[in-house]
């Protein structure tokens, strides 16, 4: 709870925000969890705390570890944890999965690729962009503010895109790179009223208290690239992100698949450490596109563990 993963490369700048944010202006203290040693606030240190931000200028592999931040108040201290991993730079071009930020999809009409985490840094335009380690050149590529725009997107534009920028701290410059995958959606096709393949309407899913459970919401929307198609889960009519129960999370990003030529999306709802109160909730799988919205409701019931007799 109140924990966030962050990663970076050695000799680059890394800035991490306290996962337990208070409002601006609150005092935030940072500690290295393993030793409970306070992180200094003086900027002359390579690693220092600056309010809600923890700065590694530059980062070293040995900085890896869990950092504790405490947002201070005389009546209500609030604690968060930043799990930081610093990796050695790769000698070859491949960017390993553990350094990749979330995948984004684009089409001929919409081809923005945002540079991940850039808002945490003090940077100035322009950004440098690379695809599969090659610097992007040509009029089709436009670096605009914190994102890359690709004109006339083609299937061949799919790949790993790296943004590179300079963070400036008190006159000193530090390099930062961040990589994410870009996939291209086919524009031809048609759309239909959403068809939910799973779960069945009013399905009862058996779960074991204390165990983890997954619910998959899967729907098809037509053929080819779909404009404004989404599947999502709701709890008691509330979006998962708004419901605010950290044990219950939607899988980041919607998986796209093509079943019999149809464009389908699925979203996995992960429930960690199932509790009694989870059985009282109504789980709605929603599929929506320009044609409308379809909803299938699931409820959980307790699965009685099977007795094992010798």
């Amino acid at each position: 709870k109140f924990s966030k993963q962050s990663w970076g490369l050695e000799n680059e700048a890394l800035i991490v925000r306290c996962p337990r944010q208070g409002k601006p202006s609150y005092t935030v203290d940072w500690y290295y969890s393993q030793t409970n040693k306070s992180i200094p606030t003086q900027e002359r240190n390579r690693v220092f705390a600056s309010g809600q931000l923890l700065k590694f200028l530059p980062a070293a592999v040995a900085d890896s570890g869990i950092y504790t931040c405490i947002v201070r108040s005389p009546t209500f201290n609030r604690t968060g944890y930043a799990n930081v991993t610093i990796y050695k730079k790769q000698s070859d071009c491949n960017v390993p999965d553990y350094l990749m930020y979330s995948t984004v999809s684009g089409s001929e009409k919409n081809s923005k690729i945002y540079c991940p985490t850039i808002d945490l840094y003090n940077w100035t335009a322009p950004l440098e962009w690379f695809k599969n380690c090659q610097a992007l050149q040509g009029s089709r590529y436009r670096a605009h503010k914190s994102f890359l725009v690709i004109d006339n997107v083609m299937t061949e534009d799919a790949g790993d895109y790296t943004c590179k920028f300079i963070h400036n701290e008190n006159g000193a410059n530090y390099s930062v790179t961040a990589t994410r995958s870009f996939t291209v959606k086919d524009e031809q096709g048609f759309s239909l009223f959403p068809v939910i393949g799973a779960p069945a309407q009013n399905e009862i899913k058996e779960v074991e208290i204390g165990k983890n459970a997954n619910l998959t919401c899967s729907a098809c929307f037509g053929k080819g690239t779909q404009f404004l198609a989404a599947v999502l889960w709701q709890l008691n009519g509330t979006k998962i992100t708004d419901f605010g129960e950290p044990r219950i999370q939607q899988e980041e990003g919607q998986n796209q698949s093509f079943s019999n030529g149809l464009a389908c999306l699925d979203m996995v709802l992960r429930i960690a450490d199932v509790k009694e109160e989870d059985l009282l909730l109504q789980y709605d799988c929603l599929a929506l596109n320009l044609h409308g919205l379809r909803r299938h409701t699931v409820r959980l019931s307790r699965k009685n563990p099977i007795d094992h007799h010798s």
Partner: antibody, heavy 117, light 111 residues
Framework: QVQLQESGPGLVKPSQTLSLTCTVS?????????WDWIRQPPGKGLEWIGY???????YYNPSLKSRVTISRDTSKNQFSLKLSSVTAADTAVYYC??????????WGQGTLVTVSS | DIVLTQSPASLAVSPGQRATITCRAS??????????MHWYQQKPGQPPKLLIY???NLESGVPARFSGSGSGTDFTLTINPVEANDAANYYC?????????FGQGTKLEIK
């Protein structure tokens, strides 16, 4: 967006127990924050009654502590106020609210409770 | 308990003019570099709404006409320029220690 709604009887007899419930939508009360009760007698100022934190810890105003209990029902995403041995001086609009750090950031619309025989 | 005393109890200000409300604490509400005083606005029939936190920080979405200042025991809420829809009761609140307490309120009327 956090939303709060108070519910409970609008009329309570003297010496009885006032019971109110606050239903929270848009956020789980076990995820974070503190969940407050505040009251305001007609035409008067605000008085903090107490709160229950996401962790279940409770903090009460000492002036009311002997008569107050704040509890929660996590399965319904609700928290409740019980105020015993009420008198006419307990007549007020009762608000539930959310404290994110030190300030009450989201409020219910309030419910008027009158203590009268 | 920390007692908060607001003054004046009421004031009337013309649109475009400045309104100043003060709040005095019975002991310091500042500690460890922060000042734990906050301001709320309450219109008739509505719950209070947070305006200023930590003495001088404007809450998100609140117009910049509102500002707060002060430290230790003496605090000021300023509205400049006042608009017609600023007519309301204004309360200070501290969070230096338990119990959290409010001032008795100041009623702002628009001439």
């Amino acid at each position: 967006q956090v939303q709060l709604q108070e519910s409970g009887p609008g009329l309570v007899k003297p010496s009885q127990t006032l019971s109110l419930t606050c239903t929270v939508s848009g956020y789980s009360i076990t995820s974070d924050y503190a969940w407050d009760w505040i009251r305001q007698p007609p035409g008067k100022g605000l008085e903090w009654i107490g709160y229950i934190r996401y962790s279940g810890d409770t903090y009460y105003n000492p002036s009311l502590k002997s008569r107050v209990t704040i509890s929660r029902d996590t399965s319904k995403n609700q928290f409740s106020l019980k105020l015993s041995s009420v008198t006419a001086a307990d007549t007020a609009v009762y608000y539930c609210a959310t404290t994110m750090m030190d300030t009450m950031d989201y409020w219910g619309q309030g419910t008027l409770v009158t203590v009268s025989s | 308990d920390i007692v908060l005393t607001q003054s004046p109890a009421s004031l009337a200000v013309s649109p475009g003019q400045r309104a100043t409300i003060t709040c005095r604490a019975s002991k310091s509400v500042s500690t460890s570099g922060n000042t734990y005083m906050h301001w709320y606005q309450q219109k008739p029939g509505q719950p209070p709404k947070l305006l200023i936190y930590l003495a001088s920080n404007l809450e998100s979405g609140v117009p910049a006409r509102f500002s707060g200042s002060g430290s230790g025991t003496d605090f000021t809420l300023t509205i400049n320029p006042v608009e017609a829809n600023d007519a309301a009761n204004y309360y200070c609140q501290h969070s230096r220690e338990f119990p959290l307490t409010f001032g008795q309120g100041t009623k702002l009327e628009i001439k």
